[in-house]
């Protein structure tokens, strides 16, 4: 196997590799730096393995995976040193590296010249005390949302930020506005930003308006 690659968004984490097998199968092992190897995806002919269940046990740990190659019909086949042939993955630290999924604007509510915009707090597969944690639960104040907003009638954008999931912004009365949000993890050096959310505009179904 080669080209071992971690594909991870909001902690849903899959290890991918090449090539498509012809006459052999793969088994994947994963461990933390200090832990024991755990086998997953036994003798599979797939070129991916979902390792989410393992990495969500501690998203701040650094993980290493390896992919063993076994010729079909001979799972005892070994390399020259008497061990099955395998390839190591790059190290992967979920908390620092998982991609931020595209956020969603849950709602917006206008009261006079103020609009409250709420970002959906997406549920992750990270668990604590048998409950799934939200993105905000996992990242806390490490997660910022940036709001872009603009009058429907103009191209000039404004921005605001929050380390909660809510924005309270000033708007001109009688004007319709459009909104888009982006998630950011300031402490990161890579995979810092999500893609922009879909644009939501006042006058559509997500909004509430009160005088």
């Amino acid at each position: 196997a080669f080209n071992l690659t971690w594909i991870s968004t909001d902690f849903k984490t899959i290890l991918e590799w090449q090539p498509k097998p012809t006459n052999y199968t793969y088994t994947v092992q994963i461990s933390t730096k200090s832990g024991d190897w755990k086998s997953k995806c036994f003798y599979t002919t797939d070129t991916e393995c979902d390792l989410t269940d393992e990495i969500v046990k501690d998203v701040k740990q650094t993980y290493l995976a390896r992919v063993f190659s076994y010729p079909a019909g001979n799972v005892e086949s070994t390399g020259s040193a008497g061990e099955p042939l395998y390839e190591n993955s790059p190290e992967f630290t979920p908390y620092l590296e998982t991609n931020l999924g595209q956020p969603t604007i849950q709602s917006f509510e206008q009261v006079g010249t103020k609009v409250n915009v709420t970002v959906e707090d997406e549920r992750t597969l990270v668990r604590r005390n048998n409950t799934f944690l939200s993105l905000r639960d996992v990242f806390g104040k490490d997660l910022i949302y940036t709001l872009y907003y603009w009058k429907s009638s103009s191209s000039g954008k404004k921005t605001a930020k929050t380390n909660t999931n809510e924005f309270l912004i000033d708007v001109d009365k009688g004007e319709n506005y459009c909104f888009s949000v982006q998630a950011v993890i300031p402490s990161r050096t890579v995979n810092r930003k999500s893609t922009d959310s879909p644009v939501e505009c006042m006058g559509q179904e997500k909004g509430e308006f009160r005088e």
Partner: antibody, heavy 117, light 107 residues
Framework: QVQLVESGGGVVQPGRSLRLSCKAS????????MHWVRQAPGKGLEWIGL????????IYDPKFQGRFTISADNSKNTLFLQMDSLRPEDTAVYYC??????????WGQGTPVTVSS | DIQMTQSPSSLSASVGDRVTITCKAS??????LNWYQQKPGKAPKLLIY???SLADGVPSRFSGSGSGTDYTFTISSLQPEDIATYYC?????????FGQGTKLEIT
């Protein structure tokens, strides 16, 4: 290491245009928001605007909207400030800065622009 | 737009003195306030972010406090190398705005 180097400043006549560059090294600009800030001689700092180079979103102080344009070339890891219809009051040192969302953590050394006939 | 009123515009103090600068925002900026130090001919340098957090490598004599609309920057014991101009910056919403600056001199 992280570095921002501005260039393109100089003396220009009123009404003319000038394009400033900010070459980044040690990081990818598309991973950050990038800003332009200026400082007139003996005066304070003044925010011009920002760009998210990944998607091209730009935000300006309204006083610069329409006359100044921020852009980025991700392949060259470079930020630009296009300044049109320049006025004497645009005379300043122009800085680019990297924004990690809690603060501007790196600044360029600044490039001076003088608008004079 | 949010206005930032910084005071004083200049101040003179002695080595070892406690120095305080304030910034008042025209509306709640939710602690999205930074303090920068600028020396002549140089780019600004970050000292304090998110109103109260000390930036990496910055001496502990510098501190920040405040929330809502009122923010304070303090140098607990002024040193000769602290001679500079200090600026606050709100970045909670655009347009981002700097305070007018405080020029600090030693008597």
């Amino acid at each position: 290491q992280v570095q921002l180097v501005e260039s393109g400043g100089g003396v220009v006549q009123p009404g003319r245009s000038l394009r400033l560059s900010c070459k980044a090294s040690g990081f990818n600009i598309k991973d950050y928001y990038m800003h332009w800030v200026r400082q007139a001689p003996g005066k304070g700092l003044e925010w011009i605007g920002l760009i998210d180079p990944e998607n091209g979103n730009t935000i300006y102080d309204p006083k610069f909207q329409g006359r100044f344009t921020i852009s980025a070339d991700n392949s060259k890891n470079t930020l630009f400030l296009q300044m049109d219809s320049l006025r004497p009051e645009d005379t300043a040192v122009y800085y680019c800065a990297r924004d990690n969302s809690y603060y501007f953590d790196y600044w360029g050394q600044g490039t001076p622009v003088t608008v004079s006939s | 737009d949010i206005q930032m009123t910084q005071s004083p515009s200049s101040l003179s103090a002695s080595v070892g003195d406690r120095v305080t600068i304030t910034c008042k925002a025209s509306q709640d900026i939710r602690k999205y306030l930074n303090w920068y130090q600028q020396k002549p001919g140089k780019a600004p340098k970050l000292l304090i972010y998110y109103a109260t957090s000390l930036a990496d490598g910055v001496p502990s004599r510098f501190s920040g406090s405040g929330s809502g609309t009122d923010y304070t920057f303090t140098i607990s014991s002024l040193q000769p190398e602290d001679i500079a101009t200090y600026y606050c910056l709100q970045h909670g919403e655009s347009p981002y705005t700097f305070g007018q600056g405080t020029k600090l001199e030693i008597t």
